[in-house]
């Protein structure tokens, strides 16, 4: 709200723009008849320095010249790069209560002369684009700096454009707005950038180029693919390009891949045949273009075409396994299981599986289709049966996989020996074995099969299995292996028409069980006590139970209890003990032991044997 510079003037020597490190003299002069009323001698001029609108210094001590009451000159040094504001004020010393009155102010800019622009680079995007050049301006000047881009070429062609840099905008690129046409392909052009500000000027070295050097073709557009006869592996990629393009680069990859397939195509004219695609796979395709075989620049990659290749009939064979159980006096239930094909084998969406169960001698055949990966049928217990399964998609079916239905554990001579199961880490178990000792027929393959030792549905919880070649004697099982769960593991040795198996239990991690078995009854029979119990609930077992312990001691005794250790068998829920004295009251309880330790004790029961117990 002040009338700026009504009271006086402020001038700068040598100029309001100075190089870094220079000093300046600032003079503040009052206009005639201005100043403190009636007392000119009491006029005191002060100079205040502001940076970013913040008062940083009173330059009272920097006076180098003083005409009392009329003007003062101050020397300022060590000014930082950028702009600094100086304000001259009048202080009437006889009136202490009045604040100093602004007289006038000046801005001093400190900067550097521009460096010669470097690294000039020019491009024309597409045949119909315009020439644009960019450069490196060098160090910041802190001053308004004008840049002029000049182009000269054949036939007295000249053209120039200007822009400036200051503290709000940067000028390091200019579009000349002119188009270079292919008929000037061999001509040479020269560009130069000149920079100028209040402290000096500089010019770049001339930069020479040809049409081919700077024209970057537009990326190809309208990309599409046509699959020959709906093939999943062969397709023709088509696109639109600028007229002068002679070279294309194609890249394509399945969407989940990390490396591109690269192809160079000369004179493709917007068309290229691909022959190595994977059926029923999501692909991404991109194309780039170049105007000259040896010179020039590649265009940017085109926008991606994303598409899925068509299906082809499945290949590979299904991994089949089965379970067989007698369900009455002359019938058996066969449950067939198989693993889904991996995507490279399925080569499409599997719509259904074709299942065949055939009795070899009578030529009885049961056939069905299912969308599930299991199939169950009841068949006679007599006869030799074989099963086959194939997978079908919209283009066809895989070759059927055959398996002979044999009694999987029927031949003792084929049972593998020395089966062991060791926990490797939290989620796998290493199973090892030795081959059958006296097999009367050659082992064709081993199957390692495992199931959790907890209640499950036969069809909802199918088995897990691994096929192992006959010369291997170990398997690392990890599919569906969870810690603190006990698994029953079977190693099957299969010949052409027979099977033998051995079983073991194993876990990947174990803890001591949460509780001990619950004693349900104690009965006396033929001078022996029978202890009956219910097993620990499966979630509380926390691994494979190795054995149970039955403890007993005389009631109110402080002696250590006696104990009897029983090998754990799920089918067993009672055990005799025979070392208790008749007509003595005992307290009994049970615990369970895993490889990690013993559970807390289960419930306590008191019992007083009546007869002679020996």
């Amino acid at each position: 709200n002040i009338d700026v510079c009504k009271l006086g003037t402020v001038t700068v020597q040598p100029a309001p723009v100075i190089p870094l490190g220079s000093a300046a003299n600032i003079s503040c002069s009052l206009n005639p008849k201005q100043g403190c009323s009636h007392y000119p001698s009491s006029n005191e001029l002060i100079l205040l320095k502001f940076v970013n609108d913040v008062l940083v210094e009173n330059l009272h001590g920097k006076k180098v010249h003083d005409h009392t009451g009329h003007s003062s000159t101050f020397q300022v040094t060590n000014l930082s790069l950028g702009m600094t504001l100086f304000v001259c004020k009048l202080n009437c010393s006889n009136s202490q209560k009045k604040p100093p009155v602004p007289v006038c102010g000046v801005e001093i800019s400190v900067g550097v002369a521009p460096e010669p622009p470097q690294n000039i680079s020019c491009v024309q995007e597409g045949e119909n684009g315009t020439v644009a050049c960019s450069w490196n301006s060098g160090k910041v000047t802190y001053l308004k700096t004008n840049y002029t881009l000049q182009l000269s070429g054949p036939n007295n062609l000249t053209c120039q454009k200007q822009c400036f840099s200051d503290n709000r905008q940067n000028c390091n690129r200019l579009d000349l707005g002119i188009n270079l046409s292919p008929d000037l392909a061999e001509s040479r052009f020269i560009v130069r950038v000149t920079a100028i500000n209040d402290l000096g000027n500089s010019s770049s070295l001339p930069h020479t180029f040809t049409f081919l050097d700077i024209v970057i073709p537009l990326p190809p557009w309208d990309i599409r693919i046509n699959f020959l006869n709906a093939s999943g592996s062969r397709g023709t990629l088509q696109w639109e390009d600028e007229g002068q393009v002679v070279l294309n680069q194609l890249r394509y990859q399945p969407l989940n891949s990390t490396s591109w397939n690269m192809v160079n195509a000369t004179n493709a004219k917007g068309k290229y045949d691909l022959r190595d695609l994977r059926p029923f796979t999501e692909y991404e395709f991109q194309i780039s273009s170049k105007l000259h075989l040896s010179g020039g620049s590649w265009s940017n990659w085109s926008e991606s075409l994303r598409t899925r290749t068509p299906e082809e009939e499945p290949v590979g064979i299904l991994d089949i396994w089965y379970m067989k159980q007698d369900i009455d006096y002359d019938r058996q239930q066969i449950s067939l299981f198989w693993k889904s094909l991996n995507p490279s084998e399925a080569r499409g969406k599997i719509l259904h599986y074709q299942v065949t169960l055939q009795e070899v001698t009578k030529k009885t055949t049961l056939q069905n289709t299912t969308r599930h990966t299991s199939w169950t049928r009841v068949i006679p217990r007599t006869g030799a049966w074989t099963a086959s399964v194939s997978a079908a998609n919209s283009k066809g079916a895989s070759a059927p996989t055959h398996i002979n239905i044999v009694d999987l554990c029927g031949t003792g001579l084929l049972a593998p020996h020395q089966v062991s199961a060791k926990s490797e880490n939290m989620d796998n178990i290493l199973v090892t074995w030795q081959p059958p000792k006296k097999a009367d027929s050659a082992v064709r393959e081993y199957i390692v099969e495992w199931r959790a030792l907890q209640p499950g549905s036969i069809t909802k919880f199918p088995p897990h299995w691994l096929r192992i070649p006959p010369d291997n004697m170990s398997a690392l099982i990890s599919e569906n292996i969870k810690p603190y769960i006990c698994y029953e593991i079977r190693v099957h040795a299969l010949s052409e028409s027979q099977g033998g198996c051995s079983s073991i239990r194993g876990d990947s991690k174990h803890k001591a069980p949460v509780s001990g078995p619950h004693i349900t009854a104690i009965t006396e029979k033929k001078e022996r006590l029978f202890i009956s119990w219910t097993h620990i609930p499966f979630p509380e077992q926390r691994g494979c139970i190795l054995h149970y312990r039955i403890y007993w001691k005389e009631r109110d005794s402080t002696a250590q209890p006696e104990l009897c250790e029983i090998q754990y068998r799920r089918s067993q829920n009672s055990h005799p003990i025979s070392s208790l004295q008749p007509r003595v009251t005992y307290v009994l309880w049970m615990t369970a032991v895993t490889a990690a330790g013993e559970s807390p004790q289960g419930n306590e029961r008191e019992f007083c044997p009546q007869g002679k117990a020996n």
Epitope: Q325, T370, H372, S374, W375, T376, R451, A452, L453, Q454, P455, G456, S457, I458, T459, K460, F461, Y487, E488, R490, S503, R505, R570, S571
Partner: nanobody
Amino acid sequence: QVQLQESGGGLVQPGGSLRLSCTASGSIFAIDDMYWYRQAPGKQREFVAYITATNSANYLDSVNGRFTISRDNAKNSVYLQMNSLKPEDTAVYYCNAKQIVGFQIDDYWGQGTQVTVSS
């Protein structure tokens, strides 16, 4: 443990129909494969039909096309609809559930319901 309770048996004339029901209770969380068996006087118990967790069904040849097994998971029940009944269908019909633990199959049985086909 699993408990099974059958109902719906009775006396019916040849060509008639009956619908047997079986309701499961107890530890049924792992029971998905349900069966019907029958035992005629002086004969061994024989398989009649079963239904799996995925509603796949299978039948004894002599009842195929006349009997239909179905289930209602919400009611923990399995049913046997018996049509065109014949005198040779006379038997005690048992509901059965099979559960697998490791490689051991546990069988659970109902107490049976009598079906008599006679004129």
